[in-house]
Structures are given as C-alpha cells and as structure tokens.
C-alpha cells in the first residue's frame, strides 16, 4: 500500500502528515469521550516518540499503527481507518508487525479504546511539537 | 423506549422528488453509532442505500447505485436523519427503512434498533 | 465492489431439523456481520451480531460462527416460528469494508 519509502518524504511532508493526524485524533478522542463512566487504564502504553525524535522516524509509527488496528477490531468509527492511512505514510515497508492483545471484556474494551486514543492524541501533540521546533532550530 | 420513526413516504410520480425523515425517540444522537436507509421492495430482499456517522464528523457512506440521486443529511438538533430523492423511477418503489447500528463491539445489542418503514410508491 | 454472497437463496425443512445459513464476504469483514430474521410486513429482527453474539431475547437455538470472510448461522432444531427469511449484514463504517446485506433465505415448510 506504500508508494514510497518514508524516507523519500520531507520535513515539510512529514509535518504535514503530523499535522492531520493530530487533527484526526483529537476527533477521535471527543467521540470515544462521549461514553461516559469509562475511566483511563493504567495498563496499556502507546509508544510515541522515537529516542532521537527527528524526521522520518519522529514516531514509533509502526507500533502506533498496530495499537490504531487493534482498536479497529472494536469499533468501527471510519475516522480510524483515516489514522492508519495516514500512519501507513510514515513507515518503511519492511517495518515489523507490532503484536496486541484485544481485551475481551465489554468494559475493558472501552477503557482500551478511551487509553489510548487519549495517548494517541497526546503523542500527536508532542510529535507536532517536535517537529515545529526542530524546524525552528534548522532555520536559527 | 428507544425509537425510530420513519415519514415523508407516499405516492411520487416518476422523475419526481421526496424527503423521509427518521426521528429518533427514547435517545439523543451520539457518537456511539450510525444511523442508515435499508430498502426493501415488495417482495425482494433488503437494499442498503447510505449510512451516516453521528459523531464529530458526518461521515458517510453510499452504495455506489444510490451517489448522486439520494443524500443523507443529520440534524442533531432535531434527533432527525433526512433522505433526499432525487429523480425517482418505477423501481424506487419499496418500503424504506432507518436503522442504527453500533460503532463499536464493545455494545450491547440495544444499539441495533429499526423503524418501521415507510412506503414509497413510484407511479405515474 | 463489496458483495455479500448468502446461500442457500430457499431452503426447506421440517420442525426439530437443524438448519445452516451461510454468507461469503468478497474480503475479510472482521467479524463485523449480523443476521436477521423477517417476516412478511415486518422490519428485519437482530438474531446474531458480531458474528457470534446472541442478540437479547433470541432463543439460544440460534447461533452464529465464521471469521474473515465465511460465517454461518445455524438453528439447531427448527421451531414452527423459525420459518421466515433470513439475511446476513456487514455493518463496518470505515472504509476498508462497507455495508451491505446479503441476499436472503429462505426457510420454509417441506
């Protein structure tokens, strides 16, 4: 589903991809906070940043992507299919699977979904943050 | 008691246009589902035609014989979903009706739930 | 384009038979599949969802199986109300699957 390696894309590319992504998860979010009575979990973690933080790999992409599919097989909210579209646009072809669990319980599939589209928004933020200052950085 | 009504059916002439409603009752619009048009011509079996997400975006989705004639739209405010029909034929002819169907597996089954339908009679 | 093959389109059968539905997707719809059942006059009523979920209410008789792209619906002994026709659904919003029903069954006397 690649046309190019990742590493084809720019800076300014990469920003852009970011950019949407931030945009779609923050919608994400707002829906999945409209089930009330759900609470955060402590037991799931989405990786976000990458250690060194710099254009193309500013995220762990990949992980992300298999967290965002994972969520797919619990709902079917078309804006997820969106996220991993634009996620698809940040990894190299030959990136590994990432390995989920699914929750099987009702209430611990809604705590899942809640947890990490909450640090999927999150990671965005910082990603874009990242990014903006790093540009800034390039330019001084 | 959860609800959904359908209105707006009747006898159309062909080329003509019309407007169902589907008014929810017994709940309020929310993220948790969507809300779709399923046709059923006398006789024949269940037609899907379009789906519309309620949520922070209207997304929506048509089988690709319905793009162009028919449109869905939301009206939150009013609890309605609307299908618009445009330049109906003889074969429009059919019993339509709403349905919401769940987003997520995660939900109990309530969030299946139908009207009644409503006739649409193509006829000169 | 998406298609939901259901098969057999009639079927007959007597009272304590057991009966099996099934449905082929075009491509995986990961679980996301209902099956209905309808009676003359009638909107379509919610047996099975998520492919093996029992809906509240129906008897347990009924059961749904399959994954990716082949599911069945089952009634293990056959009761005089069973007799109607029945259609299995795909109701996934995002875009990599779609919706659409499929083209029915149905069961009636032998």
């Known amino acids: 589903s690649h046309t190019l390696p990742v590493h084809f894309l720019q800076p300014s590319d990469i920003q852009k991809i970011v950019e949407e992504l931030q945009s779609l998860s923050k919608m994400l979010l707002k829906d999945v906070k409209e089930d009330k009575g759900v609470l955060v979990s402590q037991n799931y973690t989405l990786p976000c940043l990458t250690p060194d933080a710099q254009p193309p790999n500013i995220i762990h992409s990949p992980a992300i992507r298999a967290y965002l599919k994972t969520i797919r097989q619990l709902d079917n909210k078309s804006v997820i299919d969106e996220i991993i579209e634009h996620l698809d646009k940040l990894i190299f072809q030959d990136a590994p699977e990432t390995n989920i669990s699914v929750p099987t319980d009702t209430h611990e599939c809604k705590r899942f979904i809640l947890t990490i589209s909450q640090q999927f928004s999150e990671c965005m933020d910082l990603a874009l943050k990242s990014l903006t200052s790093g540009a800034q950085q390039a330019t001084t | 008691q959860s609800q959904l009504v359908e209105s707006g059916g009747g006898l159309v002439q062909p080329g003509g246009s019309l407007r169902l409603s589907c008014a929810a009752s017994g709940f309020s619009f929310s993220a948790n589902y969507w809300i779709c048009w399923v046709r059923q011509a006398p006789g024949k079996g269940l037609e899907w035609i379009v789906c519309?997400?309620?949520?922070?975006?209207?997304?929506?989705y048509y089988a690709p014989w319905a793009k162009g004639r028919f449109t869905i739209s939301k009206d939150n405010s009013k609890n309605t979903v609307y299908l618009q029909m445009n330049s109906l034929r003889a074969e429009d002819t059919a019993v339509y009706f709403c349905a919401r169907f769940s987003s997520g597996i995660y939900d109990l089954d309530r969030f299946f739930l139908w009207g009644q339908g409503t006739l649409v009679t193509v006829s000169s | 384009a998406f298609q939901l093959t259901q098969s057999p389109s009639s079927l007959s059968a007597s009272v304590g038979d057991r009966v099996t539905i099934t449905c082929q997707a075009s491509q995986s719809i990961e679980s996301w599949l209902a099956w209905y059942q309808q009676k003359p006059g009638k909107p379509p009523k919610l047996l099975i969802y998520q492919a093996s979920k029992l809906a509240s209410g129906v008897p347990s008789r009924f059961s749904g199986s399959g994954s990716g792209t082949d599911y069945t619906l089952t009634i293990s002994s056959l009761q005089p109300e069973d007799f109607a026709t029945y259609y299995c659904?795909?109701?996934?919003?995002?875009?990599?699957?779609?919706w659409g029903f499929g083209t029915g069954t149905k069961v009636t006397v032998l």
């Open positions: 659904q795909t109701y996934y919003g995002g875009g990599h699957i779609g």
């Open positions: 519309i997400y309620i949520g922070s975006r209207a997304d929506t």
